[in-house]
Amino acid sequence: PEPPTACREKQYLINSQCCSLCQPGQKLVSDCTEFTETECLPCGESEFLDTWNRETHCHQHKYCDPNLGLRVQQKGTSETDTICTCEEGWHCTSEACESCVLHRSCSPGFGVKQIATGVSDTICEPCPVGFFSNVSSAFEKCHPWTSCETKDLVVQQAGTNKTDVVCGPQDRLRA
């Protein structure tokens, strides 16, 4: 581990003196002196600072721009930034969630492995043998082929990854 520095945790060094940092939610107004404590002031409305700091300006809360498909997931405080998320059917383009894109749909032949969230896109997977998807969807999984046998029917047309099997009646034995 790093050896300890001249000033303790939650202090900073200025002009050969250790001053107290400002607590989260407050900004620095003036450094301490030999005779006075550090002077701090609370951040204003729509501003925040999330660490012990010596910042002279608070940061502005993030704006969740509806024109970019964003909405507020969690309102910011003096100590935390606003958290944005995307409108229903959309997801963030980055971890910072600065804009949104429409969830992708899984094409026919593919099913939804994982439904999209506000922060992650749809994950598709190819329908394996015995399963199919005949629609483009952001929700539908691959469906299993119909089991003709359980209906006392026979397969008239084999299924594919995009189509279900076609069942039909069994051929009657001729006399």
Epitope: T5, A6, I14, S16
Partner: antibody
């Protein structure tokens, strides 16, 4: 009144180590930081590092990280600077200085001469 | 590192003169500029701290001013005992750094 009394001049051999002492009086020793500064003729003043005598915590100038070690003995109100692997480049006057405000009170300086 | 520059390395003035010594930082140092006096015998004293604060026991003929990157020390009514070398030093960020010094001599 505030006083920083440094150890006397020293003549040391290249490759050896030595320690400069700085005895503080006239104030609460652990309440103020101690700086060390190097002065070579015609080379100006160079800050070596700063020590918190209360906690033993330090900050060093990168140029002196492998050269100087700052410590303190609270029981005797004395700060120390150990200099290692001495070369002719280390020949200088070294000052200990009490902080706040700025470099407020200076010791009289200790002349270190490195010579074979 | 922040570079501190004292462009005038030596200065001659007469007793009773008003003398100004300047110092420039390579970047904004807020107000954290200190001035020191080193006498010919090597003793060093703090004169001015944080641009304009007069250290205890320092005569009021010493005055500091400046902001941002440009600072100055003014000695009004120069006296014989003011013959010394004057150094500026920034206390804003580590490593602390000094100017090269201005040697003040009597004409």
């Amino acid at each position: 009144q505030v006083r920083l009394q440094q150890s006397g001049a020293e003549l040391v051999r290249p490759g050896t180590s030595m320690r400069v002492s700085c005895k503080a009086s006239g104030y609460a020793f652990t309440n103020y930081l101690i700086n060390w500064v190097k002065q070579r003729p015609g080379q100006g003043l160079e800050w070596i590092g700063i020590l918190n005598p209360g906690s033993g915590g330090t900050n060093y100038n990168e140029n002196f990280k492998d050269k100087a070690t700052l410590t303190a003995d609270k029981s005797s109100n004395t700060a120390y600077m150990q200099l290692s692997s001495l070369t002719s480049e280390d020949s200088a006057v070294y000052f200990c200085i009490r902080g706040s405000p700025g470099f407020a009170y200076w010791g009289q300086g200790t002349l270190v001469t490195v010579s074979a | 590192d922040i570079q501190m520059t004292q462009t005038t390395s030596s200065l001659s003035a007469s007793l009773g003169d008003r003398v100004t010594i300047s110092c420039r930082a390579s970047q904004d140092i807020n107000i954290y500029l200190n001035w020191y006096q080193q006498k010919p015998d090597g003793t060093v004293k703090l004169l001015i701290y944080s641009t304009s604060g007069l250290h205890s026991g320092v005569p009021s003929r010493f005055n500091g001013s400046g902001s941002g990157t440009d600072y100055s020390l003014t000695i009004s009514n120069l006296e014989q005992e003011d013959i010394a070398t004057y150094f500026c030093q920034q206390g804003y960020t580590l490593p602390y750094t000094f100017g090269g010094g201005t040697k003040l001599e009597i004409k």
